[in-house]
């Protein structure tokens, strides 16, 4: 079935949502001042190969379960994640713009990333997914 | 029980390389990160380094950067301490501790024993 | 680095007394509200153990007569009235910023 203007358009505002949630994550953790950043960044997170549409969003998802548990590190009282419902909000998003008719295998690169660069890949992803869609 | 059992105690010559060990046990030992700490004799305690089990991603303190290699298997429950070429003021206790980060907080709640280091002519 | 100055660096105390040991740091150990800092107790001998958390947490399993206090660059511990298995070394500790760093300790000595 061909893309209508608005699914095209509810899979931008759904991708609109993904990004800012990977932004906000970001930009709580990666602060020059955060006392666990260094720790966080020895975390190692899996790369895909490609992402470059919607179904290598299978690669993110597999990697939201050590992503949570990083981010579980990272709360403070000013500061308040909630890392499993943070996790769980990004996992509905995901699941629905990448979809389930067809099930997709994910290639990883060979090289592992810390956090701060897992996030800006899918961070990047998203923004140009977005931009092919407006 | 929780607890991380350390190697025991090294008399070694200045120049020769020395590997000490740290072995966890009753917990998820690749879920909880390894640090190690130094106390040179009647002195405090000094940070050198962190080591991830299930990444085997490392921080060092610049201090002790490129003087030590931190390293661990987490087949066997283990993380490591070495030194290519020891000099005698590597003569100190080491300790290994389990870093604890969750919510708002970040220290160490379990220590190993200590393993003492001494380097002498 | 952050530097953590203990006072006294030791003291004579007698059983039943009250104890109090200060830490200073060199700059703020907080961060969005939260104390990074840290108490333990060393004996001769032994590894340091776990006292307070997060400048006021008592860890599990240590005695209530053991408190933390504290915010910013000013830190306390304090021992309500002193048992003779209280006898040790008592070092603080910041986790706010690397390199971790700990104080020069305490020796409380029996009087």
């Known amino acids: 079935m061909a893309p209508t203007s608005s699914s095209t358009k509810k899979t931008q505002l759904q991708l609109e949502h993904l990004l800012l949630d990977l932004q906000m994550i970001l930009n709580g953790i990666n602060n020059y001042k955060n006392p666990k950043l260094t720790r966080m960044l020895t975390f190692k997170f899996y790369m895909p190969k490609k992402a470059t549409e919607l179904k290598h969003l299978q690669c993110l998802e597999e990697e939201l379960k050590p992503l949570e548990e990083v981010l579980n590190l990272a709360q403070s009282k000013n500061f308040h994640l909630r890392p499993r419902d943070l996790i769980s909000n990004i996992n509905v998003i995901v699941l629905e713009l990448k979809g389930s008719e067809t099930t997709f295998m994910c290639e990883y690169a060979d090289e592992t990333a810390t956090i701060v660069e897992f996030l800006n890949r899918w961070i990047t992803f998203s923004q140009s997914i977005i931009s092919t869609l407006t | 029980e929780v607890q991380l059992v350390q190697s025991g105690a090294e008399v070694k010559k200045p120049g020769e390389s020395l590997k000490i060990s740290c072995k966890g046990s009753?917990?998820?030992?690749?879920?909880?990160?390894i640090e190690w700490v130094r106390q040179m004799p009647g002195k405090g305690l000094e940070w050198m380094g962190v080591i991830n089990p299930g990444s085997g991603g490392t921080y060092y303190n610049e201090k002790f950067k490129g003087q030590v290699t931190i390293s661990a298997d987490k087949s066997i429950s283990t993380a490591y301490l070495q030194w290519s070429s020891l000099k005698a003021s590597d003569t100190a206790m080491y300790y290994c501790?389990?870093?604890?980060?969750?919510?708002?907080?970040?220290?160490?709640?379990?220590w190993g024993q200590g393993t003492t280091v001494t380097v002498s002519s | 680095a952050i530097r953590l100055t203990q006072s006294p660096s030791s003291f004579s105390a007698s059983t039943g007394d009250r104890v109090t040991i200060t830490c200073k740091a060199s700059q703020s150990v907080d961060y969005q509200g939260d104390s990074y800092l840290n108490w333990y107790q060393q004996k001769p001998g032994k590894a340091p153990k776990l006292l307070i958390y997060a400048a006021s947490n008592l860890e599990s399993g240590v005695p209530s007569r053991f408190s933390g206090s504290g915010s910013g660059t000013d830190f306390t511990l304090t021992i309500s009235s002193l048992q003779s298995e209280d006898f040790a070394t008592y070092y603080c500790?910041?986790?706010?910023?690397?390199?971790?760093?700990f104080g020069g300790g305490t020796k409380v000595e029996i009087k």
């Open positions: 500790q910041q986790s706010n910023e690397d390199p971790y760093t």
């Open positions: 501790a389990r870093w604890r980060g969750e919510g708002y907080y970040a220290y160490y709640d379990v």
């Open positions: 009753g917990y998820a030992f690749s879920n909880y990160l």
